[in-house]
Interface confidence: low
């Protein structure tokens, strides 16, 4: 997270760290007792790695009573996700067992009504992604509030030049932005999950390259079918 601040510890009990071989790779969001939603591209080249999900964490390194690392039973990328585009960039991870719920571990309601969030709405994005252009990684969860940007502006030739589909949304990126390592994490508007940070190699913190988020409401049928 660029231009953000440390989050209040355990105030986002839905927040997950998707890890490969014990290292944080991407964010994720607990959407059901046994399911974490993340971004499909996150597991690039992880076929030989051990994928796990950390729940109940604020610090990645320090012991915390609520922290628990879960093995992954199944990884389900959206069937139309592709290596060379950010379209359909969603991944569902089935935990090896139901998460032990409590004040620091709780699923987040996700948006099912397929309607765009009003431009200008302030939404919260959190993650353990880099906090500087030099690539410094935080140990403790960071967050930032970002205004939603209208799709027409986001699709300007000077911005993302038509790449933003109806199934994506944008947020402003003027020095405050999600960045590498935040992919798969939640964009929360009014206490509801609206978007998932896409995992393209976009430049961060540049106002002409707004943050791109996959709209979960657009994938309600797929999410329901996998969770069923």
């Amino acid at each position: 997270i660029l231009g953000g601040r440390e989050a209040e510890a355990h105030a986002r009990p839905y927040m997950a760290s998707v890890q490969v071989n014990g290292e944080h790779l991407c964010g994720g969001v607990l959407v059901a007792e046994q399911w974490v939603l993340s971004a499909a591209h996150c597991l690039e080249d992880a076929a030989d790695g051990k994928v796990q999900v950390l729940l109940g964490a604020h610090s990645l390194s320090q012991p915390e009573p609520s922290k628990r690392l879960y093995d992954v039973l199944r990884a389900v990328p959206h069937p139309d996700s592709r290596p060379d585009t950010i379209d359909h960039d969603l991944l569902l991870l089935q935990l090896s067992e139901k998460a032990t719920l409590g004040p620091a571990v709780r699923p987040l309601p996700w948006q099912r009504v397929d309607r765009d969030v009003e431009p200008g709405t302030l939404c919260d994005v959190a993650g353990w992604g880099i906090v500087s252009h030099a690539g410094r990684r935080p140990d403790r969860l960071q967050h930032v509030l970002l205004p939603v940007l209208d799709r027409a502006t986001c699709n300007r030739r000077t911005h993302h030049d038509g790449a933003i589909t109806q199934r994506m949304m944008c947020a402003e990126s003027n020095r405050r932005d999600s960045c590498k390592g935040d992919s798969g994490g939640p964009l929360v508007c009014g206490g509801v999950l609206e978007g998932v940070v896409t995992s393209g190699s976009r430049v961060c913190g540049n106002r002409k390259k707004p943050g791109i988020y996959t709209r979960v409401a657009s994938y309600a049928a797929w999410i329901d079918s996998v969770l069923a």
Epitope: A40, H41, L43, E44, D45, A46, A47, D48, G49, K50, V51, D71, V72, L73, R74, A75, V76, P77, S81, P83, D84, Q94, S96
Partner: antibody, heavy 120, light 112 residues
Framework: EVQLVESGGGLVQPKGSLKLSCAAS????????MNWVRQAPGKGLEWVAR??????????YYADSVKDRFTIFRDDSESMLYLQMNNLKTEDTAMYYC???????????WGTGTTVTVSS | DVLMTQNPLSLPVSLGDQASISCRSS???????????LEWYLQKPGQSPNLLIY???NRFSGVPDRFSGSGSGTDFTLKISRVEAEDLGVYYC?????????FGSGTKLEIK
């Protein structure tokens, strides 16, 4: 356009050596694991070797039939994949395909292949 | 090594028919990371193979929805709901969960 183009095939005598090359273009070669897959004339597909990306220490894996004879390696700066084949046997005669390893699947982009014939 | 056994070796069908191809692995092909790397490829005459299905049941981009994959553990099936002329060729199952990775022997789908 994502493309893989193999070269280096030909006729070689048993116990001889050959180096196959694969030129990749249209994608970030250095972030992908890569494979060689072969197909003997009129036969099925056989996986030969795999090499992972730099972030995975260029780890390599081989089929038992080629272990200790074949070496897979890559040059990320040139977007090239190679297969050094030594001590060739007649049963190595096949079409050799260079194949990209995608995210959740193994072989998402295939080259057109290069033919290796091992015969005296 | 994991042996992948495909049945039948040859499958004569009429256009518009349903086709079903079976693939059985000699041991479980669930990877240690939880994924089941079971895939289906189609090789049309004179061409390189193409990926159809990955992770048992996920259709690859651009693959028509008449193709579907199913199964778990050691038994897997590829179904084509209505065979079209462009579907003819040799179908291979493949496991990428355990080194050495292995293909099935292939099933030739041909017109009756």
């Amino acid at each position: 356009e994502v493309q893989l183009v193999e070269s280096g095939g030909g006729l070689v005598q048993p116990k001889g050596s050959l180096k196959l090359s694969c030129a990749a273009s249209g994608f970030s070669f250095n972030t992908y694991a890569m494979n060689w897959v072969r197909q003997a004339p009129g036969k099925g597909l056989e996986w030969v070797a795999r090499i992972r990306s730099k972030s995975n220490n260029y780890a390599t894996y081989y089929a038992d039939s080629v272990k200790d004879r074949f070496t897979i390696f890559r040059d990320d700066s040139e977007s090239m994949l190679y297969l050094q084949m030594n001590n060739l046997k007649t049963e190595d005669t096949a079409m050799y395909y260079c194949v990209r390893h995608g995210y959740y699947w193994y072989f998402d982009v295939w080259g057109t292949g290069t033919t290796v014939t091992v015969s005296s | 090594d994991v042996l992948m056994t495909q049945n039948p070796l040859s499958l004569p069908v009429s256009l518009g028919d349903q086709a079903s191809i079976s693939c059985r692995s000699s041991q479980s092909i669930v990877h240690s990371n939880g994924n089941t790397y079971l895939e289906w490829y189609l090789q049309k005459p004179g061409q390189s193979p193409n990926l159809l299905i990955y992770n048992v049941f996920n259709r690859f981009s651009g693959v028509p929805d008449r193709f579907s994959g199913s199964g778990s553990g050691t038994d897997f099936t590829l179904k084509i709901s209505r065979v079209e002329a462009e579907d003819l060729g040799v179908y291979y199952c493949f496991q990428g969960s355990h080194v050495p990775y292995t293909f099935g022997s292939g099933t030739k789908l041909e017109i009756k």
